[in-house]
């Protein structure tokens, strides 16, 4: 297993609709054709694999399971969007990138993006 640098923004504020987007960029040492990206959330004394995607370079990301994530790739950048977030989901979201093929296997883990989620204020009752 060889180490690889992964960069991601330090802080992102989710939209009022509970959507947060950030870029995960990795310094690929070679010409990887198969890449796996995992988003981990570290907060509340938990480590959760939020979503994971495997993609072939140049193709769309295919997320596994009931994913709350979507994303696109462009070169060594992955644009990730996490949906359905609530205030209690605020935490450190870490981007983990694995170059699966061809060998050698490379692993990179970012420092994390602190995502802040603020639940929208309920609309006041209206007489209209």
């Amino acid at each position: 297993c060889k180490a690889m640098h992964v960069a991601q923004p330090a802080v992102v504020l989710a939209s009022s609709r509970g959507i947060a987007s950030f870029v995960c960029e990795y310094a690929s040492p070679g010409k990887a054709t198969e890449v796996r990206v995992t988003v981990l959330r570290q907060a509340d004394s938990q480590v959760t694999e939020v979503c994971a995607a495997t993609y072939m370079m140049g193709n769309e990301l295919t997320f596994l399971d009931d994913s709350i994530c979507t994303g696109t790739s462009s070169g060594n950048q992955v644009n990730l969007t996490i949906q359905g977030l609530r205030a209690m989901d605020t935490g450190l979201y870490i981007c983990k990138v694995e170059l699966m093929y061809p060998p050698p296997y490379y692993l990179g883990i970012g420092n994390g993006t602190q995502i802040y989620v603020i639940d929208p204020e309920p609309c006041p009752d209206s007489d209209f």
Partner: nanobody
Framework: EVQLVESGGGLVQAGGSLGLSCAAS????????MGWFRTAPGKEREFVAA????????SYADSVKGRFAISRDNAKNTVYLRMNNLNAEDTAVYYC?????????????????WGQGTQVTVSS
């Protein structure tokens, strides 16, 4: 809704291992994320581990990461919790729970179906 029955609890010495099982009855087991929670004497219910519908995603409490492993067999409608290197702080009633869909954080309020629990006692 899914009905859940836990098994495998018991008395084990500190440093030992134990395996819990949770059998689910009902349809579409693979549509549910499954979790384990525990309640220790005098403490609130605590998240332990969870696994997504197809078993590709997991979540662990910091206190058990590296010692406990969650897995599932969708063909058998069963979720498992393998517990290694147990210590006295792991003594609790362990509950299996189910929720629809996955999430960024694991909270008991998001789990709608619960088993009756199985007692795990670690003696030192």
């Amino acid at each position: 809704e899914v009905q859940l029955v836990e098994s495998g609890g018991g008395l084990v010495q500190a440093g030992g291992s134990l395996g819990l099982s949770c059998a689910a009855s009902g349809r579409s087991f693979s549509m549910y994320a499954m979790g384990w929670f525990r309640t220790a004497p005098g403490k609130e219910r605590e998240f332990v581990a969870a696994i997504s519908g197809s078993g590709t995603l997991t979540s662990y409490a910091d206190s058990v990461k590296g010692r406990f492993a969650i897995s599932r067999d969708n063909a058998k409608n069963t979720v498992y919790l393998r517990m290694n290197n147990l210590n006295a702080e792991d003594t609790a009633v362990y509950y299996c729970a189910a929720r629809s869909g996955w999430g960024a954080a694991m909270r008991s309020a998001d789990f709608r179906s619960w088993g009756q629990g199985t007692q795990v006692t670690v003696s030192s």
